[in-house]
Interface confidence: low
């Protein structure tokens, strides 16, 4: 297709003619002006169809063969001829034509996206065709190979699209070119019929990737760096397949000083020094291929940016507690840039900077720098520090923002007792929240081991962390290696900038948490009356571990204690527990004896079953209430007794057995169940008692006796009783005895109201005792019956009974008191009535 | 005899006042751990406040914490719950119930007193 | 909080049937579970303690069994004073008591 014309991007003369003339008229591209502008009025591609001053007599039924012109080749390659031997027939005023010449430009290009081919038609303004209605057509060929042959396409073989010109003066041709043919040769003639004349251009050959017109650069801005520079920054189209060079061009208007500047760069921003207060910047770009042909694209939307009286930059700064950071400030005030010199700085309008934080950078521009910097305190909805740029003693009201965070955020990690996973926590309640910012985990894991200080690497990864109901974020390593570091901190994103907190480094293999210690057992054991507590090591972590058992009665709250175990090959520990009778709950737990990791949960629990660990230690303490008459020989006597406390039984008491002994029957047993009365005839002259508690292990071996004797019956050794109401809860019942040669082994006091039908009450207590405090509820205006019974060995003996209280007289207390009691007849843990002890108990 | 009786129930306003009793006789009220208990048609049985026999240690349900209190006078052997702030949810009939403390059961309940919360 | 699920949570039986009812824990409680019985105006009234242990002064046709978190009531004759709502409730993790929402047993 060397007969094709090749289209660059840059303008061309087109020359058409009537059939024989000559060449001798026709301009070269080369005497063309490149200072030509196109439709835009900038540099493009353009293609002129140019006939002035060149001689016609008859334009009917004639087509112009228009023909690219260069001093090497004379020859024009003909668009194949879809006419089809039509003729036009010319309307157009011939002396018209021949004083103004028929121009047309066109102008060719790839669109931003990549999709359509463009070539727009205009008629120039000294067109004699302007007024006739234009037909254009343009026909291509996108070749399937492209051989070395001098022929053009076969006929029939170009397509051809209408083009629209729905404007007189411009017709718009689209090409739609696959994206796989970008770098092809596109092949297309243009055919323009206007007032009956056709204007046929050559053969003209394009790659269209050459030809790309992108679209505008987007997102222009602008904005003071922290250094004080105006930055604009914009981003490059999209979808174009190559980099591109942009054309800037922006003003500046002050008070002061008017500049303007057009420069080329390659990158998407632009820094333009010497940025002055109280400015107007305006600002448009343009791109192109970088490194290959192509076409300007049309110039972004203007963007105008206007500086404050007072810059500061940068005009916020993020920064952790314990950092150094500086603020800058230039300051404009009534047209005038103030001296740095003059320039005072405030904090919050409250404190002054001292003078020594100040730096000058220049004659304008004044710095102040902060070090070891506290965190920010939140003031109100304010979460930062104002800083104040001052001209002496006149503050502007813009200032610059300090954001000041302790970054100071712990990570703790666990592994699981299956060692699978690695388990990191951390909280921001330590951390000032600020709107905007983000926060990340990121890590990086070394092969082995931490290292000893722990540092931020340039490359790490981010890990999801998830926030908890408890405010704390979790994050799950899964895969882990046990033995690698991992090397972790907490990233603050925000758009001021981000910030780190201390890293820390974690090795899997040193915070692993055991599972807990299962079959998980506790006893107590029979006989020796001692906890047994046993348990099974969890299977990881191989390590050595230790144990730590915590035991405690079962119920309420429970009062836990602890024990230790460091062997580690311990399975169980018996431990002494005060009640053996008592549900205990157990749980164990473990931890690697060498101190690293952590504690594993507590086992689930283990509770012990009450079971009897030895026969009842003694049988129950009982009474008796002899019902009938008593000058029969024949009584119902009933025995009464209370339950077995646990402590007793040992740990249970299943039932009761009653033992008789008499001269006449000898012995025999019965078998009461777990009744606490029992009920028998006493016919004979003695009668002894004995009541045994069995529990599942055997029956009691100390027990109570008592005989019931006729002839005891009447020993009368208690030669006085008194009682004395110390106050309605407490009674004092004191005795005095006779000799006697009987062996006396301890006391029955009975009591009883006389005003009600309600139960009697009984204690046995030591025979060595002389005086008791009988603790119950007493109404004062109700009658009490006392009975003091002596039990001998031989049986019980004659109660002295007392149906009243002794004179309620102080003075006859404390003299009874004194006689009746004296410090020889005090026993156990009973004292001498004394002045004091009748007035404590009188007035509490 | 051993028992319970409480009183203290009757229709009252969303955000008004009540305090339940619970008279206890026959048995030493001290040594016992003493819950209240109500029931409501939808809900069944519920735990609503405990007072061990420590006297100090007391617990509430999480949805009445802050406006009930759980009190006794073991001089007259009296249970208390004043309840405050009350809401159509806290009608109920409330028992008085007495824990036996091996295995953690209710071996003595009142006869129970009605609060009904209504405007 | 231990959750306690029991099932079914109505029934209709006739005299002299055999009856069970179940009782599902959330978490294991051991044997630390309790039966009662209640009546219409009536406070509740305990059964069976510890998960098998008969409460003194109810009839042996009761029993209870089950440990962890799956637990067995079962009136092994059903008599006509049965008729009633029955609770379960665990004392395993305390002081929040809690109780199942009931089975009512009727009369079929």
């Known amino acids: 297709f060397n007969l094709s014309y090749p289209i660059t991007p840059w303008r061309f003369k087109l020359s058409c003619m009537p059939p024989n003339s000559t060449y001798d008229y026709f301009l070269l591209p080369a005497g063309l002006s490149k200072n030509t502008s196109n439709l835009n009025g900038h540099y493009e591609t353009a293609v002129e169809f140019n006939s002035s001053d060149t001689h016609f007599s008859n334009l009917s039924k004639t087509t112009f063969h228009c023909c690219f012109r260069s001093e090497q080749d004379r020859n024009c390659s003909l668009c194949a001829d879809n006419i089809e031997g039509k003729t036009f027939v010319s309307t157009v005023n011939s002396s018209v034509f021949q004083q103004m010449g028929a121009n047309w430009n066109i102008q060719c290009w790839l669109k931003g996206d990549l999709k359509l081919f463009i070539c727009y038609v205009e008629s120039l303004f000294k067109n004699p065709f302007k007024n006739y209605k234009h037909k254009v057509h343009l026909l291509y060929v996108l070749p399937e190979v492209l051989e070395d042959s001098p022929l053009v396409p076969q006929k029939g073989s170009f397509q051809m699209v209408h083009c629209n010109c729905s404007v007189h003066e411009r017709c718009e041709c689209l090409v739609p070119v696959p994206t796989a043919k970008l770098n092809d040769t596109l092949l297309m003639c243009l055919k323009i019929t206007s007032g009956g004349v056709i204007f046929q251009s050559p053969l003209m050959s394009v790659q269209p990737i050459n030809m790309v017109k992108p679209d505008p650069p987007l997102g222009l801005r602008m904005e003071i760096t922290d250094d004080g520079n105006l930055k604009i920054s914009w981003s490059s189209p999209p979808l174009v397949p190559f980099p591109l060079q942009y054309e800037v061009k922006y003003s500046e208007n002050s008070t002061t000083v008017i500049r303007e500047a057009d420069k080329i760069v390659s990158a998407t921003s632009l820094l333009v020094d010497g940025i002055l207060p109280g400015s107007s910047y305006e600002v448009q770009v343009r791109g192109k291929r970088l490194d290959g042909p192509g076409i300007w694209s049309d110039w972004s939307t203007p963007h105008v940016f206007t500086t404050q009286d007072v810059i500061y930059f940068p005009p916020k700064i993020l920064t952790s507690v314990g950092s150094n950071v500086s603020f800058h400030c230039i300051y404009k005030n009534e047209n005038k840039i103030v001296s740095s010199k003059k320039i005072v700085w405030w904090m919050n309008l409250a404190e002054k900077i001292p003078q020594s934080q100040y730096d000058v950078v220049s004659d304008h521009v004044s710095k102040v720098t902060f070090f070891n910097l506290n965190e920010t305190k939140p003031r109100g909805k304010f979460t930062y520090d104002a800083v104040y740029c001052c001209n002496e003693h006149e503050c502007h009201h813009r200032y610059a923002e300090l954001y000041v965070i302790d970054v100071n955020i712990n990570i703790s990690c666990e592994t699981d007792g299956h060692l699978t996973k690695m388990t990191c926590r951390w909280s921001t309640n330590t951390i000032q929240s600020l709107a905007g910012s983000t926060l990340q985990l990121r890590y990086r894991r070394s092969s082995l081991y931490c290292f000893d200080i722990p540092s931020i690497h340039p490359i790490s990864k981010p890990k999801d962390c998830y926030l908890q109901s408890d405010g704390f974020y979790e994050c799950v390593f899964q895969p882990i290696f046990l033995l690698s570091g991992y090397t972790m901190w907490i990233r603050i994103n925000h758009p001021l900038g981000s910030l780190d907190s201390p890293p820390t480094c974690v090795l899997p293999d040193s915070v692993v948490k055991p599972l807990p210690p299962s079959s998980v057992k506790a006893e107590i054991i029979k006989n020796i009356g001692l906890l047994k507590i046993s348990w099974e090591k969890p299977v990881f972590p191989e390590n050595n571990l230790q144990f730590q058992i915590r035991y405690g009665l079962s119920g309420k709250e429970i009062q836990w204690k602890m024990y230790d175990v460091y062997d580690a090959k311990s399975k169980s520990v018996s431990l002494p527990v005060p009640d053996f009778c008592a549900v205990y709950a157990v749980q164990v737990r473990c931890k690697r004896s060498d101190g690293l990791g952590l504690w594993s949960n507590w086992s689930n629990p283990a509770y012990t079953v009450v079971m009897d660990i030895k026969v009842p230690m003694r049988g129950p303490e009982f009474w008796r209430i002899i019902n009938g008459d008593t000058m029969k020989k024949e009584k119902n006597v009933t025995l009464l007794w209370k339950p077995l406390m646990k402590n007793d039984s040992l740990c249970s008491v299943q039932r009761y057995v009653i033992n008789h002994h008499t001269s006449c029957n000898g012995t025999w047993s019965e078998d009461v169940g777990n009744h606490t009365k029992f009920t028998f005839l006493w016919t004979e002259q003695a009668h002894t008692v004995t009541v045994l508690a069995i529990n599942s292990i055997g029956a009691s071996v100390a027990n109570f006796n008592l005989t019931f004797s006729w002839p005891m019956s009447k020993v009368n050794i208690v030669q006085s009783l008194s009682a004395y109401p110390l106050n309605s809860s407490c009674v004092i019942l004191s005795w005095i005895l006779s000799p006697s040669d009987y062996k006396l082994m301890y006391f029955i006091i009975e009591w009883k109201n006389l005003n009600e039908d309600g139960e009697i009450k009984w204690l046995r207590i030591s025979s060595s005792v002389k005086k008791y405090y009988i603790h119950d509820h007493f109404i004062p205006i109700e009658k009490y019956q006392f009975s003091l019974y002596p039990i001998f060995m031989e049986g019980v003996g004659k109660p002295k009974i007392i149906n009243s209280f002794a004179q309620d007289n102080t003075e006859k207390h404390q003299n009874d008191e004194q006689k009746l009691i004296s410090e020889e007849d005090l026993g156990g843990e009973q004292k001498l009535i004394s002045e004091e002890d009748l007035h404590h108990h009188h007035h509490h | 005899q051993v028992q319970l009786v409480e009183s203290g129930g009757s229709v009252v306003q969303p955000g008004r006042s009540l305090r339940l009793s619970c008279a206890a006789s026959g048995f030493t009220f001290s040594t016992y751990a003493m819950y209240w208990v109500r029931q409501t048609p939808g809900k069944g049985l519920e735990w609503v406040a405990v007072?061990?026999?420590?006297?100090?240690?007391?617990y509430y349900i999480d949805s009445v914490k802050g406006r009930f209190t759980i009190s006794r006078d073991t001089s007259t052997n009296t249970l208390y719950l004043q309840m405050s702030s009350l809401r159509a949810d806290d009608s109920a009939l409330y028992y008085c119930?007495?824990?036996?403390?091996?295995?953690?059961?209710?071996?003595?309940w009142g006869r129970g007193t009605l609060v009904t919360v209504s405007s | 909080d231990i959750q306690m699920t029991q099932s079914p949570s109505s029934l209709s039986a006739s005299v002299g049937d055999r009856v069970t009812i179940t009782c599902r824990a959330s978490q294991s409680i051991s044997s630390y579970l309790n039966w009662y019985q209640q009546k219409p105006g009536k406070a509740p009234k305990l059964l069976i303690y510890?998960?098998?242990s008969l409460q003194s002064g109810v009839p042996s046709r009761f029993s209870g069994s089950g440990s962890g978190t799956d637990f067995t009531l079962t009136i092994s004759s059903l008599q006509p004073e049965d008729f009633a709502t029955y609770y379960c409730?665990?004392?395993?993790?305390?002081?929040?008591?809690?109780f199942g929402q009931g089975t009512r047993l009727e009369i079929k």
């Open positions: 409730q665990q004392s395993y993790s305390t002081p929040p008591i809690t």
């Open positions: 007072l061990y026999s420590d006297g100090s240690n007391k």
């Open positions: 119930a007495r824990l036996n403390w091996d295995y953690w059961y209710f071996d003595l």
């Open positions: 510890a998960a098998s």
